[in-house]
């Protein structure tokens, strides 16, 4: 079976997000990926979308992320734009209305996105072969 176009869009967005750091990418996010042993793939994607939404909702107007220059502000706006796109596409892939997110360890956003990219690339290699 062919790969979902949403999956390709997610990988593309993750590539954009992981190529460059911003002031916000060192901040922490709930690491649901480390605690996804006994969950279905759909639940993992749903939880990833949930924690990403929590992250950008919390940090969208965070002065630590907005920075002191127009350049840093622009990059932060771009980061939020890509996170919102990723969130939207993960919900589409998950196909679930909601999912519980338990307390878990924290990870930096950049590490979380790198691991999510690895998971998505593995999924893509399986569905394209």
């Amino acid at each position: 079976h062919k790969c979902d176009i949403t999956l390709q869009e997610i990988i593309k967005t993750l590539n954009s997000l992981t190529e460059q750091k911003t002031l916000c990418t060192k901040l922490t996010i709930t690491d649901i990926l480390a605690a996804s042993k006994n969950t279905t793939e759909k639940e993992t994607f749903c939880r990833a979308a949930t924690v990403l939404r929590q992250f950008y909702s919390h940090h969208e107007k965070d002065t630590r992320c907005l920075g002191a220059t127009a350049q840093q502000f622009h990059r932060h706006k771009q980061l939020i734009r890509f996170l919102k796109r990723l969130d939207r596409n993960l919900w589409g892939l998950a196909g679930l209305n909601s999912c519980p997110v338990k307390e878990a360890n924290q990870s930096t956003l950049e590490n979380f996105l790198e691991r999510l990219k690895t998971i998505m690339r593995e999924k893509y290699s399986k569905c394209s072969s």
Epitope: K12, S16, L17, E19, Q20, K21, T22, T69, A70, Q71, F73, H74, R75, K77, Q78, L79, R81, F82
Partner: antibody, heavy 123, light 106 residues
Framework: QLQLQESGPGLVKPSETLSLTCTVS??????????WGWIRQPPGKGLEWIGS???????DYNPSLKSRVTISVDTSKNQFSLKLSSVTAADTAVYYC???????????????WGQGTMVTVSS | DIQMTQSPSSLSASVGDRVTITCQAS??????LNWYQQKPGKAPKLLIY???NLETGVPSRFSGSGSGTDFTFTISSLQPEDIATYYC????????FGGGTKVEIK
């Protein structure tokens, strides 16, 4: 294909204000997430960034020129402009306008440049 | 302000030679580094972005590497049309260019 073209007087008197305009063709200057910048190059020397203006309308300027520089955008004319006040002979240079930013990246600095315009400061 | 130190300031090499230019940042700039080529009387042309990515349409003999503070730009086999001045540029915190490296043919 996006093109940038600088225009303005080639000769400015000392202590006056240098005014240049960059006209963008082949695309909209309002297109998010692109931003616009000015860079200059004195004869026989290297490149110096002057300043940039972003989609939000916010600007960044080179700290060494900040007190004398203003960059603004006129979306109706698809142009952005540079004003540099109290010029001296040290401001004699080729002035370039350029585009930064990208749709598929967080940032991407100055990939498209105008051809440049020579400005001489002399009485 | 972030300072960019580029070396050498000029070099002379033969056609087919491997040419290497280095750029050092005064602080960590991650991978926010571009390399430009400027021919006499022309505007700079972006060759490499984010330290190692080749801009579309740029020949594969051009390459870049590095991260943090130390960066390298390489022309694997110098061609006559590569005669130009090359600049590095950081855009991690505002924008600063290196002093340039003038490349000539022996």
């Amino acid at each position: 294909q996006l093109q940038l073209q600088e225009s303005g007087p080639g000769l400015v008197k000392p202590s006056e204000t240098l005014s240049l305009t960059c006209t963008v063709s082949g695309g909209s200057i309002s297109s998010i997430p692109y931003y616009w910048g000015w860079i200059r190059q004195p004869p026989g020397k290297g490149l110096e960034w002057i300043g940039s203006i972003y989609p939000s309308g916010s600007t960044d300027y080179n700290p060494s020129l900040k007190s004398r520089v203003t960059i603004s955008v006129d979306t109706s004319k698809n142009q952005f402009s540079l004003k540099l006040s109290s010029v001296t002979a040290a401001d004699t240079a080729v002035y370039y306008c350029a585009r930064g930013g990208a749709r598929d990246r967080i940032d991407h600095a100055f990939d498209i440049w105008g051809q440049g315009t020579m400005v001489t400061v002399s009485s | 302000d972030i300072q960019m130190t580029q070396s050498p300031s000029s070099l002379s090499a033969s056609v087919g030679d491997r040419v290497t230019i280095t750029c050092q940042a005064s602080q960590d700039i991650s991978n926010y580094l571009n390399w430009y080529q400027q021919k006499p009387g022309k505007a700079p042309k972006l060759l490499i972005y984010d330290a190692s990515n080749l801009e579309t349409g740029v020949p594969s003999r051009f390459s870049g590497s590095g991260s943090g503070t130390d960066f390298t730009f390489t022309i694997s086999s110098l061609q006559p049309e590569d005669i130009a001045t090359y600049y590095c540029q950081q855009y991690y915190d505002l924008y600063t260019f290196g002093g340039g490296t003038k490349v000539e043919i022996k």
